[in-house]
Amino acid sequence: GCINITSSASQEGTRLNLICTVWHKKEEAEGFVVFLCKDRSGDCSPETSLKQLRLKRDPGIDGVGEISSQLMFTISQVTPLHSGTYQCCARSQKSGIRLQGHFFSILFTETGNYTVTGLKQRQHLEFSHNEGTLS
């Protein structure tokens, strides 16, 4: 089957959600690990990740269609320490498949705002930190 990984971001007030979505077939979930890395150009692994999610096969989902699994990493307040390059990755212990998403970046600016770049064009986000709104 076709397995892929996408990255996205959303904001709720001061919170920034970084989301790694893996699309896969139901039977491929077992043994899959999804993880998010920061500033790891070559050695992104579950061990060096900020967060990881081990997928489980859900017997409640019928059919053999494609399903998605999400890892959500929530930052309550973006600070200058969050500036850097992020990447969503996944790997399967069973099949040996490794997936690497596009790199995306958080840039904290001198004005106290931050931007998230490198996502799909519609997901290029600019956030005003103090108001917590999309600008």
Partner: antibody
Framework: EVKLVESGGGLVQPGRSLKLSCAAS????????MAWVRQAPTKGLEWVAS????????YYRDSVKGRFTISRDNTKNTQYLQMDSLRSEDTATYYC????????????WGQGVMVTVSS | EIVLTQSPTTMTASPGEKVTITCRAS?????MHWYQQKPGASPKPWIY???KLASGVPDRFSGSGSGTSYSLTFNNMEAEDAATYYC??????????FGAGTKLELK
């Protein structure tokens, strides 16, 4: 078990230098931003400096800017605080702490090391 | 720089008593964290993001607040709760600031 062990404190004269170390274990050190927080005798807590996971970005409180340098060696799981031009008001217990990545709380703290600046 | 003012500075409470410590910020902040520190020990995270209990903290503790006013409450004082409590926030560009602390003693 997360462990942070500070060393390098002691008595030093005003204007002199001292270098503190913090040896970390029990977690993937290179993934975490780190900080130094100090506490003057019988006083409250005061953030001193922070460093990002890769060591390329550093941040300081105004009163130590230009005098203190925070650094880290991810191959040795250790962070440092180089303190130059020390003043009597720098006398404090210095704590090594980890930054929680999802929040702005300091989630693990070392036992602290005493620095006394006096002639 | 945002200044955090804790009150009271010192207080005494009897076992079983309800205790409330407040922290006022000089400007509005998004979250408040609280730490417990006992003599000769390093601070421990106690409550984070205003109302979430840190690992191992008894559920008699609670945190609340918004804007410039935050509080730490425990429903029935126990001997082990005697300590100094500090509030802390983050904002840009002053970064991390702490309150001066509230020393809680057992009556």
């Amino acid at each position: 078990e997360v462990k942070l062990v500070e060393s390098g404190g002691g008595l030093v004269q005003p204007g002199r230098s001292l270098k503190l170390s913090c040896a970390a274990s029990g977690f993937t050190f290179s993934t975490y931003a780190m900080a130094w927080v100090r506490q003057a005798p019988t006083k409250g807590l005061e953030w001193v400096a922070s460093i990002n996971s890769g060591g390329g970005d550093t941040y300081y409180r105004d009163s130590v800017k230009g005098r203190f340098t925070i650094s880290r060696d991810n191959t040795k799981n250790t962070q440092y605080l180089q303190m130059d031009s020390l003043r009597s008001e720098d006398t404090a217990t210095y704590y090594c702490a980890t930054h929680n990545y999802e929040s702005t709380v300091f989630d693990y703290w070392g036992q602290g090391v005493m620095v006394t600046v006096s002639s | 720089e945002i200044v955090l003012t804790q009150s009271p500075t010192t207080m005494t409470a009897s076992p079983g008593e309800k205790v409330t410590i407040t922290c006022r910020a000089s400007s509005s902040v998004s979250y408040m964290h609280w730490y417990q520190q006992k003599p000769g020990a390093s601070p421990k995270p106690w409550i984070y993001e205003t109302s979430k209990l840190a690992s191992g903290v008894p559920d008699r503790f609670s945190g609340s607040g918004s804007g410039t006013s935050y509080s730490l409450t425990f429903n029935n004082m126990e001997a082990e709760d005697a300590a100094t409590y500090y509030c802390q926030q983050w904002n840009y560009p002053s970064m991390y600031t702490f309150g001066a602390g509230t020393k809680l003693e057992l009556k």
